[in-house]
Amino acid sequence: VKMAETCPIFYDVFFAVANGNELLLDLSLTKVNATEPERTAMKKIQDCYVENGLISRVLDGLVMTTISSSKDCMGEAVQNTVEDLKLNTLGR
Amino acid sequence: EICPAVKRDVDLFLTGTPDEYVEQVAQYKALPVVLENARILKNCVDAKMTEEDKENALSLLDKIYTSPLC
């Protein structure tokens, strides 16, 4: 949950690619005004996930989730929250 | 804002070699089945995507990272 809060559109696109769902990917890419060549590039990546099957998608999703919830990222998220709180306090 | 570790993972997935990418994944999930899967996907992407495709994927990522939705 926390990782999706940091950059929701990234995770939208990532999971649409890894999921192999072309319609979902198109919807996600529309949100960032992706050009046709950019869409083509993302679909080539998506093809690799589709070709390698469900287990491949699950395993790579696991990698992304693990990285996103690692101390490298969570430490960053906590640090950002602390900075935000400091700014808000100073703002008052 | 996207986490730098995630950004590095995605950058290596697109622009690195399979060896580099798998080494990066291993820092977070050192299971042999996960690492072999990462290598398979990376090699697949390298074979499918041209230099131009990768440029386009990188420009899309820039749009994502700078989007108000990120």
């Epitope: - | 690195g16 090699n43 697949c44 074979a47 990768k54």
Partner: antibody, heavy 120, light 106 residues
Framework: QVQLVESGGGLVKPGGSLRLSCAAS????????MNWIRQAPGKGLEWISY????????YYADSVKGRFTISRDNAKNSLFLQMNSLRGEDTAVYYC?????????????WGQGTTVTVSS | EIVMTQSPDFQSVAPKEKVTITCRAS??????LHWYQQKPDQSPKLLIK???QSFSGVPSRFSGSGSGTDFTLTINSLEAEDAATYYC????????FGQGTKVEIK
């Protein structure tokens, strides 16, 4: 056009050291991964090492690991191979080769090679 | 370490004939296989990348196929200038060359 020119080869005694260089031109050197590949007299090609575009990551074949060091100077468009503890079996023509940008191919352009002879 | 085995080691073929060189990997390497041509006293030149993609400027008589562990380089109508040694290279994990196949014109 892409040009790779190796230099630094020569005759060296077993146990000795040698530093090979590869001067690159005709492309943005700092964008590309680079390799060293060798070919012993009358034999096939053997990949020995590659280095990432920034120089931060290096990989080696087992036959040279711990003895050879690949490095680069992007400001000078140069690739290097430091060879220590040289053995007779290191006698070969040494080629530098460029990888396609973003790992889109391994070894798309090669230099003409420089000859290293290890003999007492 | 992935071992690449080419066959045959040597082939003598008449002009205009078809040449087939195979390369077998000791494990699945997907499509991460490249083919090179080396003429005597010259440096190698890339012919085919990722199993079947022709490199720019390479004559159309050269083609590649295969995936997984078995790969083929085909020269459709051999010309005199094709006399050379041909090598496969895997880039699936690190890099390994096959031992080479020498093609001679009859």
């Amino acid at each position: 056009q892409v040009q790779l020119v190796e230099s630094g080869g020569g005759l060296v005694k077993p146990g000795g050291s040698l530093r090979l260089s590869c001067a690159a031109s005709g492309f943005t050197f700092s964008d590309y991964y680079m390799n060293w590949i060798r070919q012993a007299p009358g034999k096939g090609l053997e990949w020995i090492s590659y280095i990432s575009s920034s120089g931060s990551t290096t990989y080696y074949a087992d036959s040279v690991k711990g003895r050879f060091t690949i490095s680069r100077d992007n400001a000078k468009n140069s690739l290097f191979l430091q060879m220590n503890s040289l053995r007779g079996e290191d006698t070969a023509v040494y080629y530098c080769a460029r990888d396609g940008r973003y790992n889109t191919v391994a070894g798309d352009y090669w230099g003409q090679g420089t000859t290293v002879t290890v003999s007492s | 370490e992935i071992v690449m085995t080419q066959s045959p080691d040597f082939q003598s073929v008449a002009p205009k004939e078809k040449v087939t060189i195979t390369c077998r990997a000791s494990q699945n390497i997907g499509g991460s296989l490249h083919w090179y041509q080396q003429k005597p006293d010259q440096s190698p030149k890339l012919l085919i990348k990722y199993a079947s993609q022709s490199f720019s400027g390479v004559p159309s008589r050269f083609s590649g196929s295969g995936s997984g562990t078995d790969f083929t380089l085909t020269i459709n109508s051999l010309e005199a200038e094709d006399a050379a040694t041909y090598y496969c290279l895997q880039s699936y994990t690190l890099r390994t060359f096959g031992q080479g196949t020498k093609v001679e014109i009859k």
